[in-house]
């Protein structure tokens, strides 16, 4: 049998946010139901994780031997602390789209570990704020965006923006 440390060396995690409790659930992406040591996990999910606090999970299973895999869960900031804001200026709304992630609340997570991503059509931007210029008037554009913490996606949003009519004579 392999060691659990080896077997689960490349385990990945998804973070799910509960807006009522303001707590995260970490979903462990494994095929079998594992044990989580002191942290109880149900159906490979570790519950009630506080934003921006690290949690250590000791992963074991009867298909592998000691030592267990020690997984450090880097819990992201609360999702409601981010808002996708349309920053398009009214006078330029015929040919411009501006989108910005706003941090309306502070949090204790290291901001260095946060990555923003926008995809508008086939254009990809790794920025917190984007401005698309020279667009076609009266066209619909869809922009998908996500935020990652330590390369784990923890929130996403989409905006469909229709550019205004062009000015007469243009």
């Amino acid at each position: 049998k392999p060691t659990c440390d080896e077997k689960y060396a490349n385990i990945t995690v998804d973070y799910l946010y509960n807006k009522e409790t303001k707590l995260f659930t970490a979903k462990l992406n494994v095929n079998e139901n594992v044990n989580c040591g002191n942290n109880t996990c149900t159906n490979n999910e570790v519950h009630n994780l506080t934003e921006c606090k690290n949690a250590s999970v000791s992963i074991s299973h009867n298909s592998c031997t000691a030592p267990d895999k020690t997984l450090i869960l880097d819990v992201p900031p609360g999702v409601e602390k981010f808002q996708l804001h349309d920053c398009t200026q009214v006078e330029k709304a015929d040919t411009t789209i501006c989108l910005k992630w706003k941090n309306i609340e502070t949090f204790t997570c290291d901001t260095q570990n946060i990555t923003y991503r926008f995809q508008c059509g086939n254009m990809i931007f790794d920025n917190k704020e984007i401005k698309l210029e020279n667009l076609e008037p009266e066209h619909e554009y869809k922009c998908d965006s996500e935020i990652l913490y330590n390369n784990h996606k923890f929130t996403n949003a989409s905006k469909i923006i229709k550019t205004d009519f062009g000015s007469p004579g243009e």
Partner: antibody
Framework: EVQLVESGGDLVKPGGSLKLSCAAS????????MSWVRQTPEKRLEWVAY????????YYPDTVKGRFTISRDNAKNTLYLQMSSLKSEDTAMYYC????????????WGAGTTVTVSS | DVLMTQTPLSLPVSLGDQASISCRSS???????????LEWYLQKPGQSPKLLIY???NRFSGVPDRFSGSGSGTDFTLKISRVEAEDLGVYYC??????????FGGGTKLEIK
């Protein structure tokens, strides 16, 4: 190491122009809003310009509006302050400072660069 | 514009004593979102300012717990419970609620009596 390094300060005559630079390193510059803050010879701190992370929004106090322009080049990790129609009251130490968003705080400051406006 | 008035201008203290600095805003700096964006910065001689407190009472990482902030509306206070030699310098309050018109207080110089 997270660092901001200002440069470009000089002695300039009233009515003259000057461009300050602030080189950022050790962090994802394009994710941070940035500001210029100056300190007068009397040691008063004054906020003089603000720019959002992507350069979309800029703000100025009335004392410098129309004379100062803040800009940034995220590809070069550099913040700029173009100053024109300089007055003696613009004499100060100019600091660049990072603020993750408008509702956050200035958590990293540069060491400053000195601008002297005098004939 | 929001005017931030700090008192006293100069504060002579003995090491180990408590120090208290007041900051008053000319109008309420409670934002419509319910938060109050009042910050305190310390500038030591020959250095750039450093953040101590944000949102009235939150200590920035690495700031000793002898520093505490309090207040609401228009009246705010920074307290240092036991002044140490490394605390000497000029303290500035700052309001970030009235975006984008940020304003600093005039500063309070903490010095040895």
């Amino acid at each position: 190491e997270v660092q901001l390094v200002e440069s470009g300060g000089d002695l300039v005559k009233p009515g003259g122009s000057l461009k300050l630079s602030c080189a950022a390193s050790g962090f994802a510059f394009s994710n941070y809003d940035m500001s210029w803050v100056r300190q007068t010879p009397e040691k008063r701190l004054e906020w003089v310009a603000y720019i959002s992370s992507g350069g979309v929004s800029t703000y100025y106090p009335d004392t410098v509006k129309g004379r100062f322009t803040i800009s940034r080049d995220n590809a070069k990790n550099t913040l700029y302050l173009q100053m024109s129609s300089l007055k003696s009251e613009d004499t100060a130490m100019y600091y660049c400072a990072r603020r993750y968003d408008v509702w956050w705080y200035f958590d990293v400051w540069g060491a400053g660069t000195t601008v002297t406006v005098s004939s | 514009d929001v005017l931030m008035t700090q008192t006293p201008l100069s504060l002579p203290v003995s090491l180990g004593d408590q120090a208290s600095i007041s900051c008053r805003s000319s109008q309420s700096i409670v934002h419509s979102n319910g938060n109050t964006y009042l910050e305190w910065y310390l500038q030591k001689p020959g250095q750039s300012p450093k953040l101590l407190i944000y949102k009235v009472s939150n200590r920035f990482s690495g700031v000793p717990d002898r520093f505490s902030g309090s207040g609401s509306g228009t009246d705010f206070t920074l307290k240092i419970s036991r002044v140490e030699a490394e605390d000497l310098g000029v303290y500035y309050c700052f309001q970030g609620s009235h975006v984008p018109m940020y304003t600093f207080g005039g500063g309070t110089k903490l010095e040895i009596k």
